[in-house]
Interface confidence: low
Amino acid sequence: GPVSAVLTELRCTCLRVTLRVNPKTIGKLQVFPAGPQCSKVEVVASLKNGKQVCLDPEAPFLKKVIQKILDSGNKKN
């Protein structure tokens, strides 16, 4: 979280999140788990119009999708 994050310099990808995005416009979703490089889960969506945006991993429509991706990643390790 933000409090622990201030203690170390981290390498996150997302400067800010887009609050609203239509799920139908998402072409590809990348989920970066929290780890030494960044204290929080980050979600980068490649939209069908070519744009890349960061999404809020707490967004209700994303939560289940993200959990599935993280779970499948854990199984590979």
């Epitope: 390498r11 996150c12 204290s39």
Partner: antibody
Framework: QVQLQQSGAELVRPGTSVTISCKAS????????IVWVKQRPGHGLEWIGD????????FYSENFKGKATLTADTSSSTAYMHLISLTSEDSAVYFC????????????WGQGSLVTVSA | DIKMTQSPSSMSASLGERVTITCQAS??????LSWYQQKPWKSPKTLIY???RLADGVPSRFSGSGSGQDYSLTISSLESDDTATYYC?????????FGAGTKLELK
Amino acid sequence: QVQLQQSGAELVRPGTSVTISCKASGYTFTNYWIVWVKQRPGHGLEWIGDLYSGGGYTFYSENFKGKATLTADTSSSTAYMHLISLTSEDSAVYFCARSGYDRTWFAHWGQGSLVTVSA
Amino acid sequence: DIKMTQSPSSMSASLGERVTITCQASQDIESYLSWYQQKPWKSPKTLIYYATRLADGVPSRFSGSGSGQDYSLTISSLESDDTATYYCLQHGESPPTFGAGTKLELK
């Protein structure tokens, strides 16, 4: 402590270009975003774009696409903003700023670089 | 783009007075709001981030509140050093956008 040292004032001719530098110290340059902000008297503060040298990401305001180019030299911990086709509308103070520890706000600011476009 | 409506545009207050500046976003920004203080010919200084959190080294007389679309910055007891222009910034959605500023002067 975190410091952002910007280049000095520039007086340039219309139609020419200018490059402003922002040298960072006191932290790991590639771990944070550098943001650029424009300020004109009576126009407040306006976000130009930002750059994350650690991942090679740049984002631009629609208003500055084709006007500003953001780059960085990680070996010298310096960010640059190149402005082209200058007009009087580009006369302003330009600030660089470093993001907060989780990238969502502007925690530390440079002292500003004044650009004056005049014939 | 999200529009930030800041008010008042200017105000004067007496030493020791409680001062409140407000910012209204054109849509819910979920507390992704920060406040900055700028003195003439100086760079902005971060006061508050995430609507309520005090930045390092900022006196406790400054505080932030709000949620959804409505946010405020309060100075509990005005000091002479607080005369400046104050800006809000929403950074929840790209592009980040600033309020037009509030110029605060001493009476």
